[in-house]
């Protein structure tokens, strides 16, 4: 009898009520492997979730989050509110990053600007709420007459951004 059940393919179940013949999964259920004695109910993408992939007889539904939210957790089990760049999500909603921190994404937390001096470099471009600072050569490299094994980089013309 076990051999009969093992012949049932994905998308079916081994029906004990019908002499263990393979019956198709009922609507809104699936079996992703063969030899199953029951089909599982499909996940329901409801409320804050929207359907990314419909359930089929052989695979579960997959959910995504509605606009304004992004997925968290295994298989998008939760939806977290989006914020703008330059903000982070708190218990009370989206808040601007404090001075000295930035967030360049719609999710996650504000992170401190890079401390250029820790690497012996200087700040080339100031940080904002949305962007980290850009570090440039060390102050010593920029001073006139500084000895260096490599020739100094050509000075940038005013108004031109670094590549």
């Amino acid at each position: 009898l076990q051999d009969l059940c093992s012949n049932c393919p994905a998308g079916t179940f081994c029906d004990n009520n019908r002499s263990q013949i393979c019956s198709p999964c009922p609507p809104n259920s699936f079996s992703s492997a063969g030899g199953q004695r029951t089909c599982d109910i499909c996940r329901q993408c409801k409320g804050v979730f929207k359907t990314r992939k419909e359930c089929s007889s052989t695979s579960n539904a997959e959910c995504d989050c509605i606009s304004g939210y992004h997925c968290l957790g295994a298989e998008c089990s939760m939806c977290e509110q989006d914020c703008k760049q330059g903000q982070e999500l708190t218990k009370k909603g989206c808040k601007d990053c404090c001075f000295g921190t930035f967030n360049d994404q719609k999710r996650g937390i504000c992170r401190p600007w890079t401390n250029c001096s820790l690497d012996g470099k200087s700040v080339l471009v100031n940080g904002t709420k949305e962007r980290d600072v850009v570090c440039g050569p060390s102050p010593a490299d920029l001073s006139p007459g500084a000895s260096s094994a490599t020739p100094p980089a050509p000075a940038r013309e005013p108004g031109h951004s670094p590549q």
Epitope: I66, Y69, G73, A74, T90
Partner: antibody, heavy 123, light 106 residues
């Protein structure tokens, strides 16, 4: 601060109907992602989910009670309603209104609950 | 429908005890499980969501684990205010609650 206040409970005759209200404050029932539902608890028994309506006005019902339940809302009053018809003695319970999800992370759980309203079905 | 079965249905424990409550789903529900605490005459209070995430303001002695069909709520060191009834709830397909576990004073 999120608050849910139920009303409309009381003594009802068998076979009659009831309409419960849940006044929401601290959030809007039509805010994207938010779902608000009804859960009941018979005296000395466990929790039973009844119905839920979400921000997009999609409605979900307990299969065993679907034919007797209607969930609705009035966005202008920020109020949720539950209509239960053909009442029986076994519908005697405290009826809770609850909001799905937490503040900034939303999923299929209930983070905010009202204090409940008692419905007694008896002749 | 998806059924949730909690065990035990009741237990007696002392302050300081480690308490474990299990919840078994009739089929795999991923991590779509929440735990609630309810005291007599009060509304339920959310403790854990998404199987293992502690709700804000809930003491860290509460923890949740599991995925698929088997889930656990653990109270690491039972406090006097923890004597209550605990419910699991799934949100994978519609919403269903377990029958509850009453934690009583030994």
């Amino acid at each position: 601060e999120v608050q849910l206040v139920e009303s409309g409970g009381g003594l009802v005759q068998p076979g009659g109907s009831l309409r419960l209200s849940c006044a929401a404050s601290g959030f809007s029932l039509s805010t994207g992602g938010v779902g608000v539902g009804w859960i009941r608890q018979a005296p000395g028994k466990g929790l039973e989910w009844l119905a839920l309506i979400d921000w997009a006005d999609d409605k979900y019902y307990s299969p065993s009670l679907k034919s007797r339940l209607t969930i609705s809302r009035d966005n202008s009053k920020n109020t949720l309603y539950l209509q239960l018809n053909s009442l029986r003695a076994e519908d005697t319970a405290v009826y809770y209104c609850a909001r799905g999800g937490s503040d900034t992370v939303i999923g299929d759980w209930f983070a905010y609950w009202g204090q409940g309203t008692l419905v007694t079905v008896s002749s | 429908d998806i059924q949730l079965t909690q065990s035990p249905s009741s237990l007696s424990a002392s302050v300081g005890d480690r308490v474990t409550i299990t919840c078994r789903a009739s089929q795999s529900i991923g991590s779509y499980l929440a735990w609630y605490q309810q005291k007599p005459g009060k509304a339920p209070k959310l403790l854990i969501y998404d199987a293992s995430n502690l709700e804000t303001g809930v003491p860290s002695r509460f923890s949740g684990s599991g995925s698929g069909t088997d889930f656990t709520l653990t109270i690491s060191s039972l406090q006097p205010e923890d004597f209550a009834t605990y419910y699991c709830q799934q949100g994978y397909y519609l919403w269903t609650f377990g029958q509850g576990t009453k934690v009583e004073i030994k």
